[in-house]
Amino acid sequence: ELENLTVTEVGWDGLRLNWTAADQAYEHFIIQVQEANKVEAARNLTVPGSLRAVDIPGLKAATPYTVSIYGVIQGYRTPVLSAEASTGETPNLGEVVVAEVGWDALKLNWTAPEGAYEYFFIQVQEADTVEAAQNLTVPGGLRSTDLPGLKAATHYTITIRGVTQDFSTTPLSVEVLTEEVPDMGNLTVTEVSWDALRLNWTTPDGTYDQFTIQVQEADQVEEAHNLTVPGSLRSMEIPGLRAGTPYTVTLHGEVRGHSTRPLAVEVVTEDLPQLGDLAVSEVGWDGLRLNWTAADNAYEHFVIQVQEVNKVEAAQNLTLPGSLRAVDIPGLEAATPYRVSIYGVIRGYRTPVLSAEASTAKEPEIGNLNVSDITPESFNLSWMATDGIFETFTIEIIDSNRLLETVEYNISGAERTAHISGLPPSTDFIVYLSGLAPSIRTKTISATATTEALPLLENLTISDINPYGFTVSWMASENAFDSFLVTVVDSGKLLDPQEFTLSGTQRKLELRGLITGIGYEVMVSGFTQGHQTKPLRAEIVTEAEPEVDNLLVSDATPDGFRLSWTADEGVFDNFVLKIRDTKKQSEPLEITLLAPERTRDITGLREATEYEIELYGISKGRRSQTVSAIATTAMG
């Protein structure tokens, strides 16, 4: 049995059907929905036999409908059940409000039943203008939206409708006035130079698309200089200005075609930077050094002119980078006054010229070449020279006789002395000295030097020869020898050699105690640190022993007799006579005689008595050989 058909509204555009029927009896149900006034054709729906309820959407609002249903069982239709019902009223929008107003946008809020609308249609229209409205749609789920892109300080009428399929609500409207465009903040000039300035300004972040800066010379009708800069900037360098010039600088912000009121500032650029403090100092004898002061990073280049004071025609020009503040000017004449001028160039402008005068130093000199500490194989050189100029000195050593190869030395220009060694002894040399500087070789100066002779050992002399010795003397260089060795050997090599070591200051040796009348060889060697010279040699014969001879007796008397003898002249200091009777009956008689005597009368003897007589000479305390004789006194 199909029964209990009930129809209820589902919102304003649908109905809900419920019915009862035996389970599993129906193949399907046929439902027919038709406006009660039958304006439009009926809608038929076939639903499965298992259903007991169905929603019928897409109906018109506030419209009465007739709904019929029957079931189909194995091809048979059940009786039709019918019912009447009306759809609900169309839902309306609630209220619309402007929540936030800016100068270029606003926020719109509204209320509406949930799920009632597919979308909302919003229209934004400038009031009192015929300009086309801005239209936009927003999803039916939203209750708020931003409306950007508006004009500042402008009246707008905003309407909103809810829309669903073929239905649109009554519009709601609101009027609003957008705010004024925000003003710029402060405009300041933070840095001023002679050709540029820096602008700083304040403004709300993110407000402006761009800023326009206008730079105009004050009191000039010349075209202004316009710059457009991004809206993110708050600072800008304005280059390319004239020095010492007043400027008016204006700034305004731009946003979507709107310009703020301009800000303006007046400023005067600084005067063109000047060069200052030009100082010129000498750099040696062939150059000058320039130093000057100037503003940093100001100059493209400097132009320097260098001119001899007394020669107007020949000037030297140099162009230098603007970063320099000093320069060396080489290649000038020594001891010469120069005028130096400098100016700077800044983007084609020339600064006033600065000038100074200075003289180069005298040409470097060398002099006073002196030779000292001469040895047999070396000497020292010293000289004077201008300090800090010379790179090297050249020394040439030439022997005066041109027998040896010339020796050349190159030494550092800082030196003022040199030790020259490896030379031959007893040689005359000429020493030439010249100095070399980067662009000069001085005139050569010279000196002479003679190396010492090798130490000498010479002139071995034998003197004071006597029977018992002699004196050895020699010559030797001062301080050349530590010691001398004198060796004395008898010619027959029968005796051991005698060696005498003497200090290096001695030049003489007296030899005594030698054998009379034989040959000797004398050798003298010098020693230096144990090294022996080849000896000097001499041969000598000692004198024979001096003799007393020819003792004669004459003129015998009863009490005496006369004695006479011969002896070498000049040898004896005195003579000694000894007289004694041969029988030794009386005391002996001893008489000492002076050297010149060669005779002596002897008295006081006994008559007719035989006497023994002995005679010897004394020379330097030594006795000669004795001579003897027998004499007899006469009878009385």
């Epitope: 090798l454 230096t528 144990g530 010279t533």
Partner: antibody, heavy 118, light 108 residues
């Protein structure tokens, strides 16, 4: 038996100093002149310095004058060589040697190596 | 010059006589001394003065001098005589000791 034993050699930087010693035995030290001779690697002998018996007279080669000082202590039978301002060219084996009054160096030590290098 | 000049190298057959020379101005006045030096060893005095030998030096070593030249002669050279030989003299008070450059003697 005559013995001369050197010590004090080693590695030193240019400009540095070293003091060499030579201990003597087996002869009358105070009666002998003493000296130093050096030999650079692969080179010949070069006399350096000498001193007389009592130490009052000293002698130097030009190449070391003003930088080296020879001295002796007869009570300790020791000879010294103080080497200052050393140069690379001073690198050598340094021999101590003795000589009696009328002979050159007749006894030598075995030497001590001095190396002057950075 | 003041230097003493030696030949850098000399060779001799075993048992033969060899003469090593030394030249220099100082040798006009001084006798030369001669030293033998074997590798890794200290020098040894072999001749001094006119031709004196220290004790222990064989008599095959002798010295002579003429003018500015000094000579060391080894009569009947032995294998053990292979060594460097240095002459040595004085040049006066300022250069009390000078050495020659040395001669390397090879015994074949």
């Amino acid at each position: 038996e005559v013995q001369l034993v050197e010590s004090g050699g080693g590695l030193v930087q240019p400009g540095g100093s070293l003091r060499l010693s030579c201990a003597a035995s087996g002869f009358t030290f105070s009666g002998s002149r003493m000296g130093w001779v050096r030999q650079a690697p692969g080179k010949g002998l070069e006399w350096v310095s000498a001193i007389n018996e009592e130490g009052g007279q000293t002698y130097y080669a030009d190449s070391v004058k003003g930088r080296f000082t020879i001295s002796r202590d007869n009570s300790k039978n020791t000879l010294y060589l103080q080497m200052n301002s050393l140069r690379a060219e001073d690198t050598a084996v340094y021999y101590c040697a003795k000589h009696p009054p009328h002979r050159p160096f007749d006894y030598w030590g075995q030497g001590t190596l001095v190396t002057v290098s950075r | 010059s003041s230097e003493l000049t030696q030949d850098p190298a000399v060779s001799v057959a075993l048992g033969q006589t060899v003469r090593i020379t030394c030249q220099g101005d100082s040798l006009r006045l001084y006798y030369a001394s001669w030293y033998q030096q074997k590798p890794g060893q200290a020098p040894v005095l072999v001749i001094y003065g006119k031709s004196s030998r220290p004790s222990g030096i064989p008599d095959r070593f002798s010295g002579s001098s003429s003018g500015n030249t000094a000579s060391l002669t080894i009569t009947g050279a032995q294998a053990e005589d292979e060594a460097d030989y240095y002459c040595n003299s004085s040049h006066g008070p300022r250069r009390p000791v000078v050495f020659g450059g040395g001669t390397k003697l090879t015994v074949l």
